[in-house]
Interface confidence: low
């Protein structure tokens, strides 16, 4: 693995894709989504230590300033780098419709 | 302001653009950047309470699951929605060069 992908905090502790099983009720969607009734939500969770999956120059700056001023500048944060589309069957005024959401499930993660 | 822009935690506490004054030494750039010698770094700092500047559907999901499982799922995080370009004068083996970085200074912020 590249240096930027090796977690210095130990396996699984750094920013990576996690799957969280959720019902429509958990998501607050029960009143407008018909299907699926359960979703395997992929999201980005974990710490962002120095040089780990840095998204860009801004992330590098943020980490350097965080080390200097930890009370002022937070560490970079683990967020989606891209998303997988997902189709929901939704209720509409006239019936139901299929709607594709491009920004619902995280596909991979980085630190910003 | 839209509901998503009104901070329920009080003025200035939620996710927004901050400016942090930093030297080349602070940024760790002293050995490869000639100019500017100081940078007004704009970055995204602040809390992401429910419905505040939610970037997308994923952010909504994350907040709902964070409320249900706060030990497992972190709250959404304040990150750049877009960036401003910045030109650096860099040292090279043969002299100096101008380099534009598109991902260095945050332009506006949202919660993901």
């Amino acid at each position: 693995a590249r240096n930027g992908d090796r977690c210095p905090l130990g396996p699984g502790r750094c920013c990576r894709l996690h799957t969280v099983h959720a019902s429509l009720e958990d998501l607050g969607w029960a009143d407008w989504v018909l299907s699926p009734r359960e979703v395997q939500v992929t999201m980005c969770i974990g710490a962002c230590p120095s040089q780990f999956r840095e998204a860009n120059m801004h992330a590098q700056i943020k980490m350097n300033l965080h080390r200097l001023k930890p009370d002022t500048v937070p560490a970079p944060c683990c967020v989606p780098a891209s998303y997988n589309p997902m189709v929901l069957i939704q209720k509409t005024d006239t019936g139901v419709s299929l709607q594709t959401y491009d920004d619902l499930l995280a596909k991979d993660c980085h630190c910003v | 302001a839209r509901n998503g822009d009104r901070c329920p935690l009080g003025p200035g506490r939620c996710c927004r653009l901050h400016t942090v004054h930093a030297s080349l030494e602070d940024l760790g750039w002293a050995d490869w950047v000639l100019s500017p010698r100081e940078v007004q770094v704009t970055m995204c700092i602040g809390a992401c309470p429910s419905q505040f500047r939610e970037a997308n559907m994923h952010a909504q999901i994350k907040m709902n699951l964070h409320r249900l499982k706060p030990d497992t799922v972190p709250a959404p995080c304040c990150v750049p929605a877009s960036y401003n370009p910045m030109v650096l004068i860099q040292k090279t083996d043969t002299g100096v060069s101008l380099q534009t970085y598109d991902d260095l200074l945050a332009k506006d912020c949202h919660c993901v």
């Epitope: 299907s35 069957i89 594709t100 | -």
Partner: antibody, heavy 119, light 111 residues
Framework: DVKLVESGEGLVKPGGSLKLSCAAS????????MSWVRQTPEKRLEWVAY????????YYADTVKGRFTISRDNARNTLYLQMSSLKSEDTAMYYC????????????WGQGTTLTVSS | DSVLTQSPASLLVSLGQRATISCRAS??????????MHWYQQKPGQPPKLLIK???YLESGVPARFSGSGSGTDFTLNIHPVEEEDAATYYC?????????FGGGTKLEIK
């Protein structure tokens, strides 16, 4: 336009094997669950197998469990049904269908491909 | 498994009249909010075509003379007024849980 085109039809002896394919186009194949549904000569419709969009959830009708294998290649936009230990009661028209998710409906069907199992 | 029983097996209806097809499930295919029952139309030499989803929601492009109702174990497909092009076999199908099953079909003829 959504298009599902089945292929692989054949006449097979009892105990034999056959693989059906379904080429999908006109939609983002990797976002949709898919199923195979068959129609017997008596015109009864039978759901055969289901595969989720990513291929991680698979379900079979009891009548084919252990003999049929559903799979997909999202890079090739293709759905497959590998059939083995075939019986005369497997004789049917096999339809490739788009199923969306586990509790949805079949919103698109292919034209079907015929399997005849006979000695 | 939920067994779906359709009745009648065949139906002869005059042009412009109402056709009513019943589908009974051996156990509930509904939740507190939705019924996972769908209806299809099949004409000779063609694959089935989705008409109604979740018991009562008309699929896009399907004429408004088709309607569906019911919950729990009893569901109905109505066609009114019947037109010549509606001559076909109609199937119900549930997706409440696996295995998904279909009804035996109802053949509608127009006189």
């Amino acid at each position: 336009d959504v298009k599902l085109v089945e292929s692989g039809e054949g006449l097979v002896k009892p105990g034999g094997s056959l693989k059906l394919s379904c080429a999908a186009s006109g939609f983002t194949f990797s976002s949709y669950a898919m199923s195979w549904v068959r129609q017997t000569p008596e015109k009864r419709l039978e759901w055969v197998a289901y595969i989720s969009s990513g291929g991680d959830n698979i379900y079979y009708a009891d009548t084919v469990k252990g003999r049929f294998t559903i799979s997909r290649d999202n890079a090739r936009n293709t759905l497959y049904l590998q059939m083995s230990s075939l019986k005369s009661e497997d004789t049917a028209m096999y339809y490739c269908t788009r199923a969306l998710v586990e509790n949805a409906y079949f919103d698109y069907w292919g034209q079907g491909t015929t399997l005849t199992v006979s000695s | 498994d939920s067994v779906l029983t359709q009745s009648p097996a065949s139906l002869l209806v005059s042009l412009g009249q109402r056709a009513t097809i019943s589908c009974r499930a051996s156990k509930s295919v509904s939740t507190s909010t939705y019924s996972y029952m769908h209806w299809y139309q099949q004409k000779p030499g063609q694959p089935p075509k989705l008409l109604i989803k979740y018991a009562s929601y008309l699929e896009s492009g399907v004429p408004a003379r088709f309607s569906g109702s019911g919950s729990g174990t009893d569901f109905t497909l109505n066609i009114h007024p019947v037109e010549e092009e509606d001559a076909a076999t109609y199937y119900c199908q549930h997706s409440r849980e696996f295995p998904w099953t279909f009804g035996g079909g109802t053949k509608l003829e127009i006189k």
